[in-house]
Amino acid sequence: ARSEDRYRNPKGSACSRIWQSPRFIARKRGFTVKMHCYMNSASGNVSWLWKQEMDENPQQLKLEKGRMEESQNESLATLTIQGIRFEDNGIYFCQQKCNNTSEVYQGCGTELRVMGFSTLAQLKQRNTLKD
């Protein structure tokens, strides 16, 4: 299979020129997570968008000082979130705006699920909600 096939979005169309990994992260509260975007071209800065499941329109991610950090080299952009919290739950998208064409390319997204049901009662409640 072509490498692009691994990054297809649910509708089946390949995300143009930018590949995001992983597609899903589940970690306990307090852990550090990293998500990556691989680009064909380094001719543009990468920004990060974020949305809750119930949100239709992703918003630009404001990097919380001391807890969130973005880095970018030639073909790789990385978002690091330390000490993850429940409010970090959601889907994160990288977005590259190309310098020469002004075109915007967006990754398929990384879903972050923050876990941390610390008591049996909370686990039971979660299972009840699922049922």
Epitope: L49, W50, M54, D55, E56, Q59, K62
Partner: antibody, heavy 118, light 108 residues
Framework: QVQLQESGPGLVKPSETLSLTCTVS????????WNWIRQPAGKGLEWIGR???????HYNPSLKSRVTMSIDTSKNQFSLKLSSVTAADTAVYYC????????????WGQGTLVTVSS | SYELTQPPSVSVSPGQTARITCSGD??????AYWYQQKPGQAPVLVIY???ERPSGIPERFSGSSSGTTVTLTISGVQAEDEADYYC???????????FGGGTKLTVL
């Protein structure tokens, strides 16, 4: 230049439903969040809720039980209905467009005063 | 529930610098927006994304952010700057919109 224009009755009786429409001109209604915000006389701004072109809505929790929003992309319009109104709902009602990928408002209607009185 | 807190009023002499603060628990994670509202008019966006200025807004308007507080600064205040100023942001989920109570700027 995008323009927004609110329209609807300026007087509503208590316990009835307030209905307003916002018409968007000189721009597409697609791919934006469209919001309603109100301001009682001499007081601050209060967010009522938003609707996306797909019909997805988010409402202020304090008003959620009384608010319904709808959108008609073919007419470039979106609407607000607020049920069971009281005098406390008397305010200037604004419609506003949310900046794409942000949660602030770049274009506002001029506002329409709605008075709740018998 | 999240709230945004502003001082009710700020007074400043012409030519001086006015600073209006807005504090809220979600501000480290959510961008802030500032609006100017003059009597009988709709609000006008003067600062977005904490510190960016829309085209057409004078350079004397600037914004900054530090932790749970954002600040609107008006340098060299002019008589026409007298108005109500509202900060606005979202809760931590980015879903629900919040407004501060507003600050009346009086130019002495």
């Amino acid at each position: 230049q995008v323009q927004l224009q609110e329209s609807g009755p300026g007087l509503v009786k208590p316990s009835e439903t307030l209905s307003l429409t916002c018409t968007v001109s000189s721009g597409s209604i697609s791919s934006y969040y469209w919001n309603w915000i109100r301001q009682p006389a001499g007081k601050g701004l209060e967010w009522i809720g938003r609707i996306y072109t797909s019909g997805t809505t988010h409402y202020n929790p304090s008003l959620k039980s009384r608010v319904t929003m709808s959108i008609d992309t073919s007419k470039n319009q979106f609407s607000l209905k607020l049920s069971s109104v009281t005098a406390a709902d008397t305010a200037v009602y604004y419609c506003a467009r949310e900046i794409r990928e942000l949660r602030g408002f770049d274009y506002w209607g001029q506002g329409t005063l709605v008075t709740v009185s018998s | 529930s999240y709230e945004l807190t502003q001082p009710p009023s700020v007074s400043v002499s012409p030519g001086q610098t006015a600073r209006i603060t807005c504090s809220g628990d979600a501000l480290p994670r959510q961008y802030a927006y500032w609006y100017q509202q003059k009597p009988g008019q709709a609000p006008v966006l003067v600062i977005y994304k904490d510190s960016e200025r829309p085209s057409g807004i004078p350079e004397r308007f600037s914004g900054s952010s530090s932790g749970t507080t954002v600040t609107l600064t008006i340098s060299g205040v002019q008589a026409e700057d007298e108005a109500d100023y509202y900060c606005q942001s979202a809760d931590r989920t980015g879903i629900y919109v919040l407004f501060g109570g507003g600050t009346k700027l009086t130019v002495l």
